[in-house]
């Protein structure tokens, strides 16, 4: 009967208690991307720094080959920011002539891969039209939300165009997840 | 042997359990900024409301002189939104003449200061070119991520131009952190 | 005296311990909006999917009639992203003529309703001017922060113009909250 004196009335007595510092967590930071092939009909995935500088993985959360590996089932908060930068797009030149046009765009997707599913699941998407006239432009897209994940799930960040990703600073482009 | 019946198999038995309501937390909201000097080569820091309206600090997390003081080592989720607003920029006037130009920009940085380190560490940066033609413009930059912090670390929010920060509403510009 | 051997020195002995998996949590995803009336002087509220696809509610957190119902007092992290899309705005046409103009805008507000308060409380606002020339445009607004909520509080997401909300994909527009 001991060990339950702190339990609020709505807690089932069999629910596991666990130390917060023991939960799977990762914060990954940007690196220069090397050319790699990607699946057709899918945006290319970014790879990440997992241990240097501000980056870390802990408590059985591991990073390998562009994927964060989920070591334990539960509800995770997942987030990413990608900073893009580019030159004047064709879109802006067409627009200067006054003709409406499907704009250029930048997109970030946080994707879940479950080995038993044939298709990845898109968890989060941030997508933005980019039509800046006559300049170098730069801007971030931020995403973050909570999802129920299963042990063995893998997470990755896909972008519409790897060549537009700002890889110069670890605080500008990053990806993380933690068990709640 | 009591008190461990809920412990999952991967938890070390010496790991501290603690009540969630006891964790350091803060949500700070915008105030009108007073003119203050800032360090050379560093964006000016914002100061904040810490107790009125939606703002609060609790469980030994304190706010003083633009800084959130970290009272306990651990992994923290840190976030901020800054809403900027301004008039037509010079950039847009140059762009109207059709000449590419380095655009004006708005930037938010969440910075960690550790007394034993000579230089602050930039944890998060959101930076965006602003080239809007012929109008008043306004837009937010949002940042959030998890970092391992040490007791005694201090957090602040720096912006590229304090005069562009929208300080009119507590829900538009804010800064917070909580121990995971 | 048992059950406290893991308690760190700063934890009050009467503080409740509880299993993380037992905490109220919800992630809601976008659905096509039906025409509904809304209060004067208040932006219209979105309604949401609460159980299909990526959406879920758990541990007494319920969704009903555009509201997330808070079942337990405490500190919650609340977040939302709304992706907007639209056609060329009047603003851009006026701007082409070179006259400064109050720009069109898109706004997201996360609002708290407490039955004992006559007025809703705006917790978070993301607002952005939109002045894109000659194109279809699209962009997200993301918000997230921590708030102290009371049992019985209700949360909703309001937008400046429901007709501009991208309801096509559950990963583009969403709303969530979880007890810390």
């Amino acid at each position: 009967l001991k060990g339950q004196e702190f339990a609020p009335s709505h807690q089932q007595v069999y629910a596991p208690l666990r130390a917060d510092g023991d939960k799977p967590r990762a914060h990954l930071t940007v690196v220069r991307q090397t050319a790699t092939q990607h699946f057709k009909n899918q945006f290319p995935a970014l790879h990440w720094e997992h241990e240097l500088g501000l980056a870390f993985t802990k408590n059985r959360m591991n990073y390998t080959n562009k994927f964060l590996l989920i070591p334990e089932s539960g509800d995770y908060f997942i987030y990413s920011q990608v900073t893009f930068r580019g030159m004047t797009s064709e879109c802006s030149e067409i627009r200067q002539a006054g003709r409406p046009n499907k704009p250029d765009s930048i997109t970030v997707v946080i994707t879940k891969v479950t080995d038993s599913y044939p298709e990845p699941t898109q968890l989060l998407m941030g997508t933005k039209s980019v039509c800046e006239v006559g300049s170098n432009w730069f801007q971030p897209i931020y995403l973050g939300a909570m999802f129920s994940l299963q042990e063995g799930d893998k997470l990755m960040v896909n972008v519409s165009d790897i060549s537009l990703v700002d890889y110069t600073k670890e605080d500008k482009t990053f990806f993380g997840a933690f068990l709640l | 042997l009591k008190g461990q019946e809920f412990a999952p198999s991967h938890q070390q038995v010496y790991a501290p359990l603690r009540a969630d309501g006891d964790k350091p937390r803060a949500h700070l909201t915008v105030v009108r900024q007073t003119a203050t000097q800032h360090f050379k080569n560093q964006f000016p820091a914002l100061h904040w409301e810490h107790e009125l309206g939606l703002a609060f600090t609790k469980n030994r997390m304190n706010y003083t002189n633009k800084f959130l003081l970290i009272p306990e080592s651990g992994d923290y989720f840190i976030y901020s939104q800054v809403t900027f607003r301004g008039m037509t920029s010079e950039c847009s006037e140059i762009r109207q003449a059709g000449r590419p130009n380095k655009p004006d920009s708005i930037t938010v940085v969440i910075t960690k200061v550790t007394d034993s380190y000579p230089e602050p560490t930039q944890l998060l940066m959101g930076t965006k070119s602003v080239c809007e033609v012929g109008s008043n413009w306004f837009q937010p930059i949002y940042l959030g991520a998890m970092f391992s912090l040490q007791e005694g670390d201090k957090l602040m929010v720096n912006v590229s131009d304090i005069s562009l920060v929208d300080y009119t509403k507590e829900d538009k510009t804010f800064f917070g952190a909580f121990l995971l | 005296l048992k059950g406290q051997e893991f308690a760190p020195s700063h934890q009050q002995v009467y503080a409740p311990l509880r299993a993380d998996g037992d905490k109220p949590r919800a992630h809601l995803t976008v659905v096509r909006q039906t025409a509904t009336q809304h209060f004067k002087n208040q932006f219209p509220a979105l309604h949401w999917e609460h159980e299909l696809g990526l959406a879920f509610t758990k541990n007494r957190m319920n969704y009903t009639n555009k509201f997330l119902l808070i079942p337990e007092s405490g500190d919650y992290f609340i977040y939302s992203q709304v992706t907007f899309r639209g056609m060329t705005s009047e603003c851009s046409e006026i701007r082409q003529a070179g006259r400064p103009n109050k720009p069109d805008s898109i706004t997201v507000v996360i609002t708290k309703v407490t039955d004992s308060y006559p007025e809703p409380t705006q917790l978070l606002m993301g607002t952005k001017s939109v002045c894109e020339v000659g194109s279809n445009w699209f962009q997200p607004i993301y918000l997230g922060a921590m708030f102290s909520l009371q049992e019985g509080d209700k949360l909703m997401v309001n937008v400046s113009d429901i007709s501009l909300v991208d309801y096509t994909k559950e990963d583009k527009t969403f709303f969530g909250a979880f007890l810390l």
């Epitope: 510092g21 023991d22 690196v31 220069r32 090397t34 790879h47 990440w48 720094e49 997992h50 241990e51 240097l52 500088g53 501000l54 980056a55 870390f56 993985t57 802990k58 408590n59 059985r60 959360m61 591991n62 990073y63 390998t64 080959n65 562009k66 890889y167 670890e170 | 080592s73 651990g74 391992s148 | -």
Partner: antibody
């Protein structure tokens, strides 16, 4: 085979700037997942990480020394240069450079080849 | 930011002894590396990523651990093993332990 060699002054005066060069062979700093790291060891004391620079131009410095350190690379010459300003007698140490490498993204960087070190004494 | 504490700092042992050195991290880490240093020489990689033997290192050396507690074990101490051993990790900027000197008893 992989070799690294540190070069620089054996004696510097307090307040002066130390410039050390690491010249290496057997690998290229333009190859993915390669880097060069500087480590120092005061006499009779433990190792201390100073800074490293990676194949993709990322630089990391010990936060406690960051304002004094600069690291740079010349890929064509197979050299990495470390400068440390405002030297003090407590900076007296053997300074090592080493290769950092990892097998793939997700594995951990290791310091698998080291130079023999150069003793730098700070004294007036 | 992450402190590594080795124990013991000094260890006297005889040839053939089983020797265990522990490294405690102030916060959980995923990987620990071990280096061996002999007097007047540069350090040498011994164990990487907690439990992997570096090239050319004898199999009497092994590493284990997770989270905040890591161990280097020498199953049967040989004369050439008398040296100082350092643990190392990269997270939140690289840190070394203070070293464990293994001496002849």
């Amino acid at each position: 085979q992989v070799t690294l060699k540190e070069s620089g002054p054996a004696l510097v005066k307090p307040t002066q700037t130390l410039t050390l060069t690491c010249t290496f062979s057997g690998f290229s700093l333009s190859t993915s997942n390669m880097g060069v790291v500087w480590i120092r060891q005061p006499p009779g004391k433990a190792l201390e990480w100073l800074a490293h620079i990676l194949w993709d131009d990322r630089e990391y410095s010990n936060p406690a020394l960051k304002s004094r350190l600069t690291i740079s690379k010349d890929t064509s010459k197979n050299q990495v240069v470390l400068t440390m300003t405002n030297m003090d007698p407590v900076d007296t140490a053997t300074y090592y450079c080493a290769r950092m490498s990892r097998n793939y993204y997700g594995s951990s960087y290791v310091m698998d080849y080291w130079g023999q070190g150069t003793l730098v004494t700070v004294s007036s | 930011d992450i402190q590594l504490t080795q124990s013991p700092s000094f260890l006297s042992a005889s040839v053939g002894d089983r020797v265990t050195i522990t490294c405690s991290a102030s916060s959980s880490v995923n990987y620990m590396h071990w280096y061996q240093q002999k007097p007047g020489k540069a350090p040498k990689l011994l164990i990487y990523s907690t439990s992997n033997l570096a090239s050319g290192v004898p199999s009497r050396f092994s590493g284990s651990g997770s989270g905040t507690e890591f161990t280097l074990t020498i199953s049967s101490l040989q004369p050439e093993d008398f040296a100082t051993y350092y643990c190392h990790q990269w997270n939140n900027y690289g840190t070394f332990g203070q070293g464990t000197k293994v001496e002849i008893k």
